[in-house]
C-alpha cells in the first residue's frame, strides 16, 4: 500500500492557496469533487464541494474557499483566500464515485499560515482583505458528506500546490456578491 | 423513507457486554454519503455521543467510552451493531441508533426509537 | 472536550408568545475557510428519540417549521420559536460537531405559561 504523503505550503495570513489536484481525465471528469480537512482520530470534514455532476470550469464557492473543475485538464483548482492562522491544518482533494468510498488525489496538503507581514509594496499588516461577500452555495442535498481511510494500492496522481503572485486578480465569473480586489502576498 | 430500529436485550447484569444491534430499512447502510452513530440518553439526562461507523468499517469512538465500545457494521443484513463490555448501573440508558451527518451538515437527521437498556443484577 | 452550555435549564412561555433558548459553547464552533459553524439543535418530546431541527446553526432542516429558527456564531448561539405552540412543549438540545468528540448541550426544557 502506497504510504499517504504530505505536501508542506507555509504562507501568511491573507494569502491565498492554490491547489492543483490532477485527476485521471477519462474517468474522473463529470464526477463531484471536495475539497476536506482532516483532523487526527476524525472523520474527514468536506468544507466544499463541486456540483453533482460536476460542471466543467463553473466555480462553486463556500466561504473563502472556491473550487473549479477542469475537465479538458483533469485537475480541480482549490483557492483558499485570505487566509487566517485558523485553517493551518491538513487537507485533501477527493473524487465522489458512489456508492463506492470516494477516491483521494494526491498528495494531502499540509496547510501552516502564520501571522507576520508578507512585505508586499502597498499593503500593510492592519489592513483586511475582505475580499468576499458569499451567500451559502451548498446545499445538503448537493454534496456527500464523508470519506473514510482507505488503502491506496497503487501510485496516486499528484497534486501541485502555489501561492498566487502580488499583482494576481481572484478573476471569477458567474458568482454572486463577489466584490474582486487583489491578493497581495 | 429511511428508518432505523434498535434492538438487543433489556436487561444486562453488570460486568458483561451490552450488546445492540440497529437494523436501516427504506434506503442502504452502504451509503457513500452517510455514517452510522450511536447515542445514549440515561434517565431524565442529556444526550451523550458513542460512535460512529462507516459502511467500510472505519470507526469513530468517544475517547471517554472508547476502551469499552466496538461498533461493527454488517451491509448484508443493512445493519450495524453496538457492544459495550464491563457495564455498570451508569450505563443504564436509552440506547439510539441514528444516522450520522454530522461531517458535513452538523447533525444526526434520522433516529431510531431507541431501546431502553438497564444494567443491574 | 468542547463543553456545551444550554440556558435557561427551563422556560415557561404562553401560547403564541416567542420562546428563546440559548446556547454557548467553550470554544468556537466556526470553521471561518467555509463560513459554516457546526452545530445543531433538536427537540425531544416525552417518550420520543430527539428530531433534528437546525444544522449549521441556522439551516432549518426540510420539514421544519418556520416557527423554529437558529442564529449566531462562533460560541454563542440561539434557538428561538417565535410563535409557541402547544406541540412545540418539549426538550430542546443544542449539539457542536465541530470537534470530536460530538456533545451536546443539557437540554432546555419548554413548557405552556
Known amino acids: 500500500a502506497t504510504k499517504l504523503t504530505e505536501e508542506k505550503y507555509e504562507l501568511k495570513e491573507g494569502q491565498t492557496l492554490d491547489v492543483k489536484c490532477d485527476y485521471t481525465l477519462e474517468k474522473f471528469a463529470s464526477s463531484q469533487k471536495a475539497w476536506q480537512i482532516i483532523r487526527d482520530g476524525e472523520m474527514p470534514k468536506t468544507l466544499a464541494c463541486t456540483e453533482r455532476p460536476s460542471k466543467n470550469s463553473h466555480p462553486v464557492q463556500v466561504g473563502r474557499i472556491i473550487l473549479e473543475d477542469y475537465h479538458d485538464h483533469g485537475l480541480l483548482r482549490v483557492r483558499m483566500v485570505n487566509l487566517q492562522v485558523e485553517d493551518s491544518g491538513l487537507y485533501q482533494c477527493v473524487i465522489y464515485q458512489p456508492p463506492k468510498e470516494p477516491h483521494m488525489l494526491f498528495d494531502r496538503i499540509r496547510l501552516v499560515v502564520t501571522k507576520g507581514f508578507s512585505g508586499t509594496p502597498g499593503s500593510n499588516e492592519n489592513s483586511t482583505q475582505n475580499v468576499y461577500k458569499i451567500p451559502p452555495t451548498t446545499t445538503k442535498a448537493l454534496c456527500p458528506l464523508y470519506t473514510s481511510p482507505r488503502t491506496v494500492t497503487q501510485a496516486p496522481p499528484k497534486s501541485t500546490a502555489d501561492v498566487s503572485t502580488p499583482d494576481s486578480e481572484i478573476n471569477l465569473t458567474n458568482v454572486t456578491d463577489i466584490i474582486r480586489v487583489p491578493v497581495f502576498n | 423513507q429511511l428508518q432505523l430500529q434498535e434492538s438487543g436485550p433489556g436487561l444486562v447484569k453488570p460486568s458483561e457486554t451490552l450488546s445492540l444491534t440497529c437494523t436501516v430499512s427504506?434506503?442502504?447502510?452502504?451509503?457513500?454519503?452517510?455514517?452510522w452513530g450511536w447515542i445514549r440518553q440515561p434517565p431524565g439526562k442529556g444526550l451523550e455521543w458513542i460512535g460512529s461507523i462507516y459502511y467500510s468499517g472505519s470507526t469513530y469512538y468517544n475517547p471517554s467510552l472508547k476502551s469499552r465500545v466496538t461498533i461493527s457494521v454488517d451491509t448484508s443484513k443493512n445493519q450495524f451493531s453496538l457492544k459495550l463490555s464491563s457495564v455498570t448501573a451508569a450505563d443504564t440508558a436509552v440506547y439510539y441508533c441514528?444516522?450520522?451527518?454530522?461531517?458535513?451538515?452538523?447533525?444526526?437527521?434520522?433516529w431510531g426509537q431507541g431501546t431502553m437498556v438497564t444494567v443491574s443484577s | 472536550d468542547i463543553v456545551m452550555t444550554q440556558s435557561p435549564d427551563s422556560l415557561a412561555v404562553s401560547l403564541g408568545e416567542r420562546a428563546t433558548i440559548n446556547c454557548k459553547s467553550s470554544?468556537?464552533?466556526?470553521?471561518?475557510?467555509?463560513?459554516?459553524?457546526?452545530l445543531a439543535w433538536y427537540q425531544q418530546k416525552p417518550g420520543q428519540p430527539p428530531k433534528l431541527l437546525i444544522y449549521?446553526?441556522?439551516t432549518r432542516e426540510s420539514g421544519v417549521p418556520d416557527r423554529f429558527s437558529g442564529s449566531g456564531s462562533g460560541t454563542d448561539f440561539t434557538l428561538t420559536i417565535s410563535s409557541l405552540q402547544a406541540e412545540d412543549v418539549a426538550v430542546y438540545y443544542c449539539?457542536?460537531?465541530?470537534?470530536?468528540?460530538?456533545?451536546f448541550g443539557g437540554g432546555t426544557k419548554v413548557e405552556i405559561k
Open positions: 441514528a444516522r450520522d451527518s454530522g461531517q458535513y451538515t452538523g447533525s444526526l437527521d434520522v
Open positions: 427504506g434506503g442502504s447502510i452502504s451509503s457513500s454519503d452517510y455514517y
Open positions: 449549521w446553526a441556522s
Open positions: 449539539q457542536q460537531v465541530y470537534l470530536f468528540p460530538w456533545t
Open positions: 470554544q468556537s464552533v466556526l470553521y471561518s475557510s467555509n463560513n459554516k459553524n457546526y
